[in-house]
């Protein structure tokens, strides 16, 4: 059936355009030939002018931006809210792990507490920073914890007769800690567990944040002039003929959108791989690859490592006595 | 063996959970996230259709606009005519992605590689190096309680897992609310309604 004749006075077009662009000077009073139009090429008289066409193109591109954001809204909310939940949850886990470790020191080794609390605090601060992407080496964090703890254990528990420890003997004891493997294989064990679980946690958060970045990138794409013209033709050219209530055909919309989104659709392959790789990572996040599991049990392994030192206390005291004799003599003078 | 900090576990402030009947752990929440994400696995390939489903298109109307004229919704002209003599769609597609899209693709490639190298091969959850250190002794490995490795009588079972972190103390789990069926199913069906 032929389209209804355009509005003889362009009145409807005028009142619609008024909403887009207050000030009516661009709308013809009555239909005109429209020979200067570049997008809404008329088959007969038209109620559009070149200026109106330009305004329609601008509106179409803004409209497209909001539609893109609407289409990705649910996905974006999903990832952002989960990234927020997990980041906060990981911080809570770290806080609890610190509390558990401090409680273990308080209840089992009260003589170590003031200094132990400080070292434990520093260690877990580093853990938090690492998860959030800080450039810290996990092995160094664990070494620092045990290097700091050993002088306190030695001077408070194994050799309490020593005067307040001085930097000299502390340095020697820190060195002896590694050379003599005073904590056995526990530091290595903790390094392995903590580094594996934290690496996975960190990459998990990084991946979620990148997911948000991907959606933001496509949400704020600037569309080409060609795309702007196609959108204008689809959404607004019907108005030039006075067809205000008619909507674009669905199949036509899909063709236009495929044209406009051609570049974006190239993300598809990598997006699929992203979700499947993330799934694989998540499936492996248990036992030593689960930071919650590892960190909340750390107090126990640290406790066992101190017990190990105590068991070998006699031997160690003798060896260290010789090894750090020079420092001790200077200290006693 | 270690003094076990029970007092911390039962601290009401720390471990209260919003909905006891649906206790949630971090691992269950991670799995739930992946399930939801998988319903968006076709997101980018289906994006043109999603956008059409968000924009006004003729759904119940008999007539629709094809870029040039008013046509019947199911006629051959409904998709075709509007593109004719206007812009070369093939050329538009040939231009390739713009720089920001290429950049984000590079970032995705990089994270995908990282994710793959970090993923644990099935059946390899405990490294050989850890096996040798006596980590797998004892009966630790059921779903509810996990062992934290330490040798000898220091083996401790940690209550699995902060029962999802009550400091986020409200229920985040409404994915089954009626009507919230994800993009994948919902919109894919809807956007087919007006194909020519």
């Amino acid at each position: 059936q032929p389209p209804p004749p355009p509005d003889a006075t362009c009145h409807q077009v005028r009142s619609f355009f008024q909403r887009l662009q207050p000030g009516l000077k661009w709308v013809p009073e009555t239909p005109v030939p429209g020979s200067d139009l570049q997008v809404c090429l008329p088959k007969g008289p038209t109620c559009c002018s070149r200026k109106m066409e330009e305004k329609y193109q601008l509106t179409a591109r803004l409209n497209m931006e909001q539609l893109l954001q609407s289409a990705s809204m649910e996905l974006k909310f999903l990832i952002i809210q989960n990234a927020a939940v997990f980041q906060e949850a990981f911080e809570i886990v770290v806080r609890h792990a610190k509390n558990y470790t401090n409680a273990m020191f308080k209840n089992n080794y009260p003589s170590l507490t003031p200094q132990a609390f400080e070292f434990v605090g520093e260690f877990f601060t580093d853990v938090s920073l690492y998860i959030l992407g800080s450039d810290i080496n996990v092995d160094d964090m664990v070494n620092e914890l045990f290097d700091s703890l050993f002088p306190v254990i030695y001077t408070q528990m194994m050799n309490p007769g020593l005067p307040e420890s001085v930097l000299d003997i502390n340095e020697c004891l820190r060195g002896a800690r590694r050379d003599l493997k005073v904590f056995g294989s526990f530091p290595k064990l903790i390094m392995t567990q903590v580094s594996k679980s934290l690496q996975v946690t960190r990459i998990f958060l990084q991946a979620l944040n990148l997911g948000i970045e991907v959606i933001n990138t496509t949400d704020h794409l600037k569309f080409s002039k060609d795309c702007g013209r196609m959108l204008t033709r689809m959404w607004y050219c019907s108005y030039c003929q006075g067809l205000m209530m008619v909507k674009p055909c669905g199949g036509y919309c899909n063709v236009v959108m495929q044209g406009c989104m051609a570049g974006v659709v190239e993300i598809d392959k990598y997006w699929r791989e992203y979700i499947l790789s993330l799934e694989e990572l998540v499936n492996g996040m248990y036992r030593i690859y689960d930071m919650e599991n590892v960190l909340l049990g750390l107090f126990s392994t640290i406790h066992d490592s101190i017990q190990y030192v105590q068991k070998n206390g006699g031997k160690l005291t003798t060896t260290i006595g010789k090894l750090c004799a020079h420092s001790q003599q200077r200290q006693y003078r | 063996s270690a003094y076990y900090p029970e007092d911390l576990f039962i601290d009401k402030k720390i471990l209260k959970v919003a909905h006891v009947e649906h206790e949630e752990t971090l691992s269950s929440r991670r799995r739930e996230l992946i399930q939801k994400l998988k319903s968006f696995i076709n997101f980018y390939s289906a994006l043109p259709g999603y956008i059409c489903s968000h924009s006004p298109v003729a759904e119940n109307d008999t007539l629709c606009w094809n870029g040039q004229e008013l046509v019947e919704r199911y006629s051959q002209k409904a998709a075709r005519n509007g593109m004719k003599n206007q812009f070369n769609l093939h050329e538009l597609k040939m231009k390739g992605p713009e720089p920001v899209v290429s950049q984000i693709i590079d970032k995705l490639k990089h994270i995908n590689q990282l994710l793959r190298t970090m993923s644990v091969p099935k059946g390899k959850v405990l490294d050989k190096s850890l096996d040798e250190e006596g980590l797998e002794s004892g009966d630790c490995g059921d779903d509810e309680d996990e062992c934290i490795g330490s040798s000898g009588d220091g083996m401790v079972k940690v209550k699995n897992q902060l029962r999802f972190l009550a400091e986020l103390a409200y229920d985040l789990d409404v994915d089954d609310a009626p009507g919230n069926k994800q993009h994948g199913n919902q919109k894919d069906n809807e956007i087919t309604t007006s194909h020519s």
Epitope: Q69, I80, Q81, A83, I212 | S55, L168, P178
Partner: antibody, heavy 120, light 107 residues
């Protein structure tokens, strides 16, 4: 209990800008987006935009782009809206409202509103 | 933008009656419609989300229905405290848009 406490009423002259605040408590601030709504003439409600406190990501109603700027301060669990180039048209009650715990919940808790009167 | 039209600006009803407030969307918004109640001098309060789900603490005399473009909020057994403005909201598309509101008056 979820609460959103907004700053008090404002009587301002036409001019550069005004910042109103919305302090959230009783829930995890970073997890839920915060939306802002304008109510003029005691009836008409308009959605201004939303912000994700987790990363400061914003989405605006095109109508309010350049008129409103949304920000958050995570450390104090506070959301802010700055209104720019104030005119009498901006006189209204402005509400902050939490977007529910997960995508489909819409705005589930609202602040008490901040009345803004712009008059010379 | 999607226009949400609440054609009845005012509705008058008696305590114990059943009343239906309608909202029409200018395009298909699937089920992403919420309803809000605003009592005089107060901020809006969430009643219904996703067309038909009651928010916590909302009495079961409030029910929502509809899909696509036509939505209804029904209050059965109206109480005097239900005197308020009722607004619908769509969140299918940005910008989210509200209906103009329906004032419920109790005879």
């Amino acid at each position: 209990e979820v609460q959103l406490q907004q700053s008090g009423p404002e009587l301002v002259k036409p001019g550069p800008s005004l910042k109103i605040s919305c302090k959230a408590s009783g829930y995890s601030f970073t997890v839920s987006p915060m939306t802002w709504v304008k109510q003029s003439h005691g009836k008409n409600l308009e959605w201004i935009g939303l912000i994700h406190p987790y990363n400061g990501d914003t989405t605006y109603n095109q109508k309010f782009k350049g008129k409103a700027t949304l920000t958050v301060d995570k450390s104090s669990s506070t959301a802010y809206m700055e209104l720019l180039s104030l005119t009498s048209e901006d006189s209204a009650v402005y509400y902050c409202a939490r977007w529910g715990n997960y995508y489909p919940y819409a705005m589930d808790y609202w602040g008490q509103g901040t009345s803004v009167t712009v008059s010379s | 933008d999607i226009v949400m039209t609440q054609s009845q600006k005012f509705m008058s009803t008696s305590v114990g009656d059943r009343v239906s407030i309608t909202c029409k969307a200018s395009q298909n918004v699937r089920s992403t419609v919420a309803w809000y109640q605003q009592k005089p001098g107060q901020s809006p309060k969430a009643l219904i989300y996703l067309t038909s789900n009651r928010h916590t603490g909302v009495p079961d005399r409030f029910t929502g229905s509809g899909s696509g473009t036509d939505f209804t909020l029904t209050i059965s057994n109206v109480q005097s405290e239900d005197l308020a403005d009722y607004f619908c909201l769509q969140h299918w598309n940005y910008p989210y848009t509200f209906g103009g509101g329906t004032k419920l008056e109790i005879k």
